[in-house]
Amino acid sequence: QPSVSPGEPSPPSIHPGKSDLIVRVGDEIRLLCTDPGFVKWTFEILDETNENKQNEWITEKAEATNTGKYTCTNKHGLSNSIYVFVRDPAKLFLVDRSLYGKEDNDTLVRCPLTDPEVTNYSLKGCQGKPLPKDLRFIPDPKAGIMIKSVKRAYHRLCLHCSVDQEGESVLSEKFILKVRPAFKAVPVVSVSKASYLLREGEEFTVTCTIKDVSSSVYSTWKRENSQTKLQEKYNSWHHGDFNYERQATLTISSARVNDSGVFMCYANNTFGSANVTTTLEVVD
């Protein structure tokens, strides 16, 4: 347990006095927090946190889902933790299959273990397929497996967390990695026609095509020197992964002389912006 100088508040003391505890499924979890200023126990795992205001945390029949970090906090805001593994041969992994990765960033496959003494904790491809050669990962039994520097090529990769138990490979449920691409260029914008000459009362319709790596690209039609919101209609397509196209069509059903002017199709992403213009001249 931590030691501090006399007079200073000290962290609570937990019994049993170890950082990790392994119990068998069905057995009792009994944790005692000793501190004159005891406030609460907090339990954290995957999708939840629970609190307990009793200084003794007792779970009579432990389940795999009781695996997690138990933290005791005192009135000074100081805390101490113990991590409990509830060993259940039938449930080696706790999983949350939501798996998103931002290109070039790390992402966590959430499959913490209920038994830290299994071996070869790693990732495997689905249906026996190998993982991409450049995929690097770091396993952490208490959190899951961190995929380092996600690549665009990993999009929709199917994988399992895997361990060896008694010489056999055990797989978790399937995870599907969804990669959000990093914008590495401005959107590509083009317009159906650069200029229009119309008579009064004729319909003005112009289409802007926006191409980018994802549907997160923003686009809008603007009239130069005007804040008025223009009415536009969208059609969009994914031409395979990371090849997104949107068509934004601006229509004025009955053009008037004062509709004449420059209309700009503007698009932006986190990398930058692009625009293209078309000129409308309406004569009476």
Partner: antibody
Framework: QVQLQQPGAELVKPGASVKMSCKAS????????MHWVKQTPGQGLEWIGV????????SYNQKFKGKATLTADKSSSTAYMQINSLTSEDSAVYYC??????????WGQGTLVTVSA | NIVLTQSPASLAVSLGLRATISCRAS??????????MHWYQQKPGQPPKLLIY???NLESGVPARFSGSGSRTDFTLTIDPVEADDAATYYC?????????FGGGTKLEIK
């Protein structure tokens, strides 16, 4: 127990903006994506967008891009959605929903936004 | 965008009988055998409540009277037997692809 607390109602004037909150408790806020959904009698349920856990990245439905802005305050475990340039078409119930194990497992009670002069 | 079409828009089912609601997607919502399709129940004045996830998995705490089936583009929610408390609107939702989309809803009335 997981809870998402939203204010019951907001009355706002046309042209103004509104920032609604979604206070999360009962789980580690920074570990889960928070989605926002709009519900109107005419359009049904519409996904507005998501703020991703950890880094605060966002992804929007194009229909709401430029209209809605999603943010989060980790210190108070609160997600926010701001809607600007309000019109009568923005009158709706807005829900926050936590994504858990691929699905929207927890929903707030919703904030009724009424746009009226 | 993936369009989800629910049918029927409304149905009335007698107590104790079976209710079947269909949801058709404009394109597949499957990846490697996982169908990213979910079903929600909504009662007036309440938020949607998750019933079925990944097409056929029963959410914890939801009665076994509710079941889901289907893959790729065609999905079904079945309630058997129907109880009085099941009167509500039911929505399908896909999160295979941005933007996530919901079906138009099916209003279930109990006779």
């Amino acid at each position: 127990q997981v809870q998402l607390q939203q204010p019951g109602a907001e009355l706002v004037k046309p042209g103004a903006s509104v920032k609604m909150s979604c206070k999360a408790s009962g789980y580690t806020f920074t570990s889960y994506n928070m989605h926002w959904v709009k519900q109107t009698p005419g359009q049904g349920l519409e996904w507005i967008g998501v703020i991703y856990s950890g880094n605060g990245d966002t992804s929007y439905n194009q229909k709401f891009k430029g209209k809605a802005t999603l943010t989060a305050d980790k210190s108070s475990s609160t997600a926010y959605m701001q809607i600007n340039s309000l019109t009568s078409e923005d009158s709706a119930v807005y829900y926050c929903a936590r994504e858990r194990d691929t699905r929207f497992g927890n929903w707030g009670q919703g904030t009724l936004v009424t746009v009226s002069a | 965008n993936i369009v989800l079409t629910q049918s029927p828009a409304s149905l009335a089912v007698s107590l104790g009988l079976r209710a079947t609601i269909s949801c058709r997607a404009s394109e597949s919502v499957d990846i490697y055998g996982n169908s990213f399709m979910h079903w929600y129940q909504q009662k007036p004045g309440q938020p949607p409540k998750l019933l079925i996830y990944l097409a056929s998995n029963l959410e914890s705490g939801v009665p076994a009277r509710f079941s889901g089936s289907g893959s790729r583009t065609d999905f079904t929610l079945t309630i058997d037997p129907v109880e009085a408390d099941d009167a509500a609107t039911y929505y399908c939702q896909q999160n295979n692809e941005d933007p996530y989309t919901f079906g138009g809803g099916t209003k279930l009335e109990i006779k």
